[in-house]
Interface confidence: low
């Protein structure tokens, strides 16, 4: 799931920490104010920014889908890391969903690789 273009649905709370931009950019974990004068901290667990930036809003944290486990939570400088549940995997071609791993190999083939969160079981032809 990529949410890099999404911004939070809430406005900046007045109590959030502010500092001054350096050369027009704000550090990771912050976004810039509309007048470009302040850097405002992202809200822990709600939004984040990973790079020096001039974003007007921090990026909204990804929420892991059902069928995924949260490996690490969202911080102000890093998005949530989600991983497919045991027995499922995410294909490069269809990263939007976890697919069930096959339970076994077709006849005439042997298993050489287990199901992982990023790959199905691997089968090769018997010698």
């Amino acid at each position: 799931i990529t949410q890099q273009d999404l911004a939070p649905q809430q406005r900046v709370a007045p109590q959030q920490k502010r500092s001054s931009p350096s050369e027009g950019l704000c550090p990771p974990g912050h976004h810039i104010s509309e007048d470009g004068r302040d850097c405002i901290s992202c809200k822990y667990g709600q939004d984040y920014s990973t790079h020096w930036n001039d974003l007007l809003f921090c990026l909204r944290c990804t929420r892991c889908d059902s069928g995924e486990v949260e490996l690490s939570p969202c911080t102000t400088t890093r998005n949530t890391v989600c991983q497919c549940e045991e027995g499922t995997f995410r294909e490069e071609d269809s990263p939007e969903m976890c697919r069930k791993c096959r339970t076994g190999c077709p006849r005439g083939m042997v298993k050489v690789g287990d199901c992982t969160p990023w790959s199905d079981i691997e089968c090769v032809h018997k010698e």
């Epitope: 990529t2 890099q4 273009d5 999404l6 911004a7 939070p8 649905q9 406005r11 931009p21 027009g24 950019l25 810039i32 104010s33 509309e34 007048d35 470009g36 790079h51 020096w52 930036n53 001039d54 007007l56 809003f57 909204r60």
Partner: antibody
């Protein structure tokens, strides 16, 4: 299927007003930011205005600030552009475009066919 | 000087690969921006092609074939759109977009007219 259909364009005299509408269908309108982008005859694209998903935050290009007002009615799945004090240089095809996000990014993933506004005496 | 510079016109033969350039003014740093590309065929509205931030952070527009790909050269402050296996229907105007510093206002490049030579 995402569809954006603009209407309300036409011929207007300098100093006059016009209200453009954009009817949206095929997606949950109330969860997306929206934009107006214009293109003068034979020219490039010029961003005009943007509005976030709820309508609470509105942004304008310097060239239209104080003259144009962007608004939306989420109950009617409609986006509007009220254009006042029109000038000859506002003559263009006006496109309604959907933002990829709830707020406003540079990712305008769906566009309408456009409506032509001509400002001339 | 505009924030984004695109060459006005480029051409290449059918079936070849071409790379379109979008140069960000040097008081900005392309390293912190995504580069967006739009295609506009004559008589049609613009169409979103792709967004490129890095190899691991990019997105393709709806129904946009993988012949269209993005890249960035941070040292040269440039974004690129590569189109492989050029087809007649690729003849169009191509616009890039990036964020202007501390502003949500949307800045488009001036566009590059691509001609596909047969």
């Amino acid at each position: 299927e995402v569809q954006l259909v603009e209407s309300g364009g036409g011929l207007v005299k300098p100093g006059g007003s016009l209200r453009l509408s954009c009817a949206a269908s095929g997606f949950t309108f109330s969860t997306y930011g929206m934009h107006w982008v214009r293109q003068a005859p034979g020219k490039g694209l010029e961003w005009v205005a943007g509005i976030n998903y709820s309508g609470n935050n509105k942004y304008y290009a310097d060239s239209v600030k104080g003259r144009f007002t962007i608004s939306r009615d989420n109950a009617k799945n409609s986006l509007y552009l009220q254009m006042n004090s029109l000038r000859a240089e506002d003559t263009a095809v006006y496109y309604c475009a959907r933002d990829h996000s709830t707020w406003l990014s540079r990712h305008l993933d769906y566009w309408g066919q456009g409506t032509l506004v001509t400002v001339s005496s | 000087q505009p924030v984004l510079h695109q060459p006005p016109a480029m051409s290449s033969a059918l079936g070849t690969t071409i790379r379109l350039t979008c140069t960000l003014r040097n008081d900005h740093d392309i390293g912190v921006y995504s580069v967006y590309w739009y295609q506009q065929r004559p008589g049609h509205p613009p169409r979103f092609l792709l967004r490129y931030f890095s190899q691991s952070d990019k997105s393709q527009g709806p129904q946009v074939p993988p012949r269209f790909s993005g890249s960035k050269d941070v040292a040269r402050n440039r974004g690129y759109l590569s189109i492989s296996e050029l087809q007649p229907e690729d003849e169009a105007m191509y616009y890039c977009a990036m964020g202007a510093r501390s502003s949500v206002t949307h800045v488009f490049g001036s566009g590059t007219q691509l001609t596909v030579l047969s």
